[in-house]
Each structure stands twice: as structure tokens, then as C-alpha cells.
């Protein structure tokens, strides 16, 4: 008799999830010599232990504690780049500017980037059919709780000047409901963080508007200022040129506004 299985509204666990996490861990520890001591089998066991046999709407930050411990890593607190709705450019940037870090440049962020996972209560099975959707089903699901946990810890670790890359092509350049707007902004530590500097990335080539005057940016400035953190904002009019100038800062065309 086939067992009844809960149908959730979101996509199921990414296929070959265990193999993917393990392979990513091995790759990361090979690329980053300072993480070579990490036992990737233990990392997978801790990851699995956070959600296997647990109701996928009842996951807590505590469930991920064993994984957090194994993911201990040095991150220069003044070299943190946050992002919202513009992940690809943020990652292209840190691939060039190697001393800066997004969350996905850390082991834990790298392991989980773009993956979905969930289990089922009282069975050791991974659910490849469906997983809870944050809006339609529940917010305390394995994926959402993971990202909320690591995003909070990443923001807590930041110091001095923190940068955030924002997508100027979206109707809400700063979205209070994004991970940046709902988690990271509120977990920057005012005693450690002096300034949040927003980089607003323009989409259209002919777009010369000052998007730092956008009402949602003003809202971000207000939230940050109330937390006793200074705020600054820069328009990145030409992201292609911006990346090029990060690669080759001596280029004569890089002295003008980007």
C-alpha cells in the first residue's frame, strides 16, 4: 500500500541533493586551503541531521547548530558584500575582487546556493516531490530557516563599512521583505558597523537617473540611520564597465563615473 505523502506548494528537493552537497564541500575545501581540515562527510551528516525525520514546517535555528559549528570560518568583517535581487553581479564582483565576500563565498553559503531540500516527519526519506513554500505553506521550512540563520550570522559578523548591491531595475530597489531587508539590515551591529554603503546597479544603458533618490532607498536610509549606522549610496550606471574597472583599475576610462 503506497504511503500517503504530504503535498507542498513548492518544488521538491533538488535532485542528487546529498551528492551535490558533498561534492560542493569537497570542491570548496580543495579551493580554499584554510578549510582543508573540514571533514565533508561530517558536514553532510550535520546538514542532513538538521531536516531529516523532522516536520518540514517545524525547523528551528537550533536544528542547524551542528552544521554552523562545522562551518566555522574566518571572514574579514570589513570586507562583507551583501546583495538583494542581484546575486549574479555580486558574485561576479567577488570573483574579481577576491578579498571581498558574499555569503555564498563562505562554505555554508556555497553548499546551499540555489538548492532546495526538505524531509518528512518520522521517516528518513528526503522529499523529492515537493517542499513547503515560504508564503503558501510555512516560513519555518528547512531552506528558509537555513538562509535566515546564516544571513543573520553573516550580518552580525560585519564591521566598519558594509556594502550592499541593489538591483536598480526592480520596482522596489530596496525591498523590506527580502532577506537583506528583513534579516540582514536588522542584524548589523551599530557598535561595529560605521557605514552601510549601497551600490544601486542600473539596468538600462541610457539610464542616467539618480536612483539613490528612489523612495525605497530613502526608506533604507531611514531604517539604517535609526539604528545609528551611517548610510551612503552610489549609482553604478554601467555594471559592465564597473566590473571591467575592478579588473583593470589602471585603465584610463576608469577615472570617469561608472
Amino acid at each position: 500500500v503506497p504511503r500517503w505523502r504530504q503535498q507542498w506548494s513548492g518544488p521538491g528537493t533538488t535532485k542528487r541533493f546529498p551528492e551535490t552537497v558533498l561534492a560542493r564541500c569537497v570542491k570548496y575545501t580543495e579551493i580554499h586551503p584554510e578549510m582543508r581540515h573540514v571533514d565533508c562527510q561530517s558536514v553532510w551528516d550535520a546538514f542532513k541531521g538538521a531536516f531529516i525525520s523532522k516536520h518540514p514546517c517545524n525547523i528551528t535555528e537550533e536544528d542547524y547548530q551542528p552544521l554552523m559549528k562545522l562551518g566555522t570560518q574566518t571572514v574579514p568583517c570589513n570586507k562583507i558584500l551583501l546583495w538583494s535581487r542581484i546575486k549574479d553581479l555580486a558574485h561576479q564582483f567577488t570573483q574579481v575582487q577576491r578579498d571581498m565576500f558574499t555569503l555564498e563565498d563562505t562554505l555554508l553559503g556555497y553548499l546551499a546556493d540555489d538548492l532546495t531540500w526538505c524531509g518528512e516527519f518520522n521517516t528518513s526519506k528526503i522529499n523529492y516531490q515537493s517542499c513547503p513554500d515560504w508564503r503558501k505553506d510555512c516560513s519555518n521550512n528547512p531552506v528558509s530557516v537555513f538562509w535566515k540563520t546564516v544571513s543573520r550570522r553573516f550580518a552580525e559578523a560585519a564591521c566598519d563599512v558594509v556594502h550592499v548591491m541593489l538591483n536598480g531595475s526592480r520596482s522596489k530597489i530596496f525591498d523590506k521583505n527580502s532577506t537583506f531587508g528583513s534579516v540582514e539590515v536588522h542584524n548589523l551591529q551599530p557598535e561595529k558597523v560605521q557605514t552601510l554603503e549601497a551600490w544601486v546597479i542600473h539596468g538600462g544603458r541610457e539610464d542616467s537617473r539618480d536612483l539613490c533618490q528612489d523612495p525605497t532607498i530613502k526608506e533604507l536610509e531611514s531604517i539604517i540611520s535609526k539604528r545609528n549606522i551611517q548610510f551612503s549610496c552610489k549609482n553604478i550606471y554601467r555594471p559592465d564597465k564597473f566590473l571591467q574597472c575592478v579588473k583593470n583599475p589602471e585603465d584610463s576610462s576608469c577615472t570617469s563615473e561608472i
Partner: nanobody, 117 residues
């Protein structure tokens, strides 16, 4: 600016004890969870222990549980690590860091603990 100064390390025989201290400044000490992490020769950064801002909650790595005790004195802005039943594998430079991890930027010079007969 967060500043920390670790002390108390030294050479000790297996089974021996040490007490590490970390004096912190530049921030409201009691507002922050604090952690000890260690860097052993040829290995990567390992989390050892964390204590909440009030001192009411503590957690430990499995490798040190039952042997190490973390504590703090908020009136002195100081973090401690009492290390008992020391083993050769505890040999490392010990750093204190603000926060609970897993992302750390330790600011001090650390204090070297060598366990050897």
C-alpha cells in the same frame, strides 16, 4: 573599534590545566556573545566555545565538552576559558572573538597553548 587581548597560554603537560583570559574594549561587552576559536598547526580555524552576552547560555565543541569551561565577567569586560585535562590535540593558538559564529574575524594576537610532555 573592537579590540581584544588574549593571555594565559603556555606550555603544559598532558592532563594539566590552563586558564585563558581575553580583555575586550571598544564596544559594550555585555551586549555581545563571545567565542573562543583556535588555530592548530597545519589545520584550519576550529570553533571551541560560545557564551551569551549575559553569560546565561554556553555551548561547546564536542572535542572539548566536559573539559573546558567558558565564562565572562562583564564588569571587567573579560572573557575566560578554563581548560582542564588538556591533550596534545588541544595545542593551538587560541583567539577570542565577538559573536557566535560561524563567521569570525579575530582581532587579537591570540595566545599559544602547547600541550606536551
Amino acid at each position: 573599534e573592537v579590540q581584544v587581548l588574549e593571555s594565559g597560554g603556555g606550555l603544559v603537560q598532558p592532563g594539566g590545566s590552563l586558564r585563558l583570559s581575553c580583555e575586550a574594549s571598544g564596544f559594550t561587552f555585555s551586549n555581545f556573545a563571545m567565542s573562543w576559536v583556535r588555530l592548530a598547526p597545519g589545520k584550519g580555524l576550529e570553533w571551541v566555545s560560545t557564551i551569551s552576552g549575559s553569560g546565561g547560555s554556553t555551548s561547546y565543541a564536542d572535542s572539548v565538552k566536559g573539559r573546558f569551561t567558558i565564562s565572562r565577567d562583564n564588569s571587567k569586560n573579560t572573557l575566560y576559558l578554563q581548560m582542564n585535562s588538556l591533550r596534545a590535540e588541544d595545542t593551538a593558538v587560541y583567539y577570542c572573538a565577538d559573536g557566535r559564529g560561524p563567521f569570525f574575524d579575530y582581532r587579537g594576537q591570540g595566545t599559544l597553548v602547547t600541550v606536551s610532555s
